[in-house]
């Protein structure tokens, strides 16, 4: 079953290569288990950036080597992606799945365009 997912259109990463955005979903039921996946679309190719499964009221469970962190509050997920460089600029899509209890719902956002600008190296000082 389909579900609406909303996310911002554009986000600019900070000078340390960190970008944050909110992924909000319209839950049609009372889910206890939610899975959030961040996908990156660039040059018509889609790759998985990170994924987390969490319980309502609990923290997001990203694997230890993930570049993503996040928190949840109600039907909102606050996602942070770290370690970004200019080459990582692209469309980052939030996918939300209500895993339990049935029925299963899935929704995909329109994507957040994340712009990453590599910082200029500091000039040598004499």
């Amino acid at each position: 079953k389909a579900m609406h997912v909303a996310q911002p259109a554009v986000v600019l990463a900070n000078s340390r290569g960190t970008a944050s955005f909110v992924c909000e979903y319209a839950s049609p039921g009372k889910a206890t288990e939610v899975r959030v996946t961040v996908l990156r679309q660039a040059d018509s190719q889609v790759t998985e950036v990170c994924a987390a499964t969490y319980m309502m009221g609990n923290e997001l469970t990203f694997l230890d080597d993930s570049i993503c962190t996040g928190t949840s509050s109600g039907n909102q997920v606050n996602l942070t992606i770290q370690g970004l460089r200019a080459m990582d600029t692209g469309l980052y899509i939030c996918k939300v799945e209500l895993m339990y209890p049935p029925p299963y719902y899935m929704g995909i956002g329109n994507g957040t365009q994340i712009y990453v600008i590599d910082p200029e190296p500091c000039p040598d000082s004499d």
């Epitope: 288990e33 899975r35 499964t53 969490y54 319980m55 609990n58 923290e59 469970t61 694997l63 230890d64 895993m99 339990y100």
Partner: nanobody
Framework: QVQLVESGGGLVQPGGSLTLSCAAS????????MAWYRQAPGKEREVVAG????????NYGDSVKGRFTISRDNAKNTVYLQMNSLKPEDTAVYYC??????WGQGTQVTVSS
Amino acid sequence: QVQLVESGGGLVQPGGSLTLSCAASGFTFSSYTMAWYRQAPGKEREVVAGISRSGGTTNYGDSVKGRFTISRDNAKNTVYLQMNSLKPEDTAVYYCRAVSDYWGQGTQVTVSS
């Protein structure tokens, strides 16, 4: 293969206590949020408690808050549910859950005088 084996269930009087254990094997236990669910006869399965991978975050169903405590030992691949001040309405089959992939077979808890 993946196994979640619950133990510790049984018959207890109202006001009594029980501790359920769930021993996990066949998957990377520390990578999973763990939970306890329960299902009473004729009712839907409901969440009792959940605990994050590190054990740093827990959450509870409204009906058990202040009475039940979930904990985990990642070194032993085990999650626990300490149940105090048990009530007849806590009678159910209690299931261990590796969110959102695996279920245990369940252990029966009966609260009756």
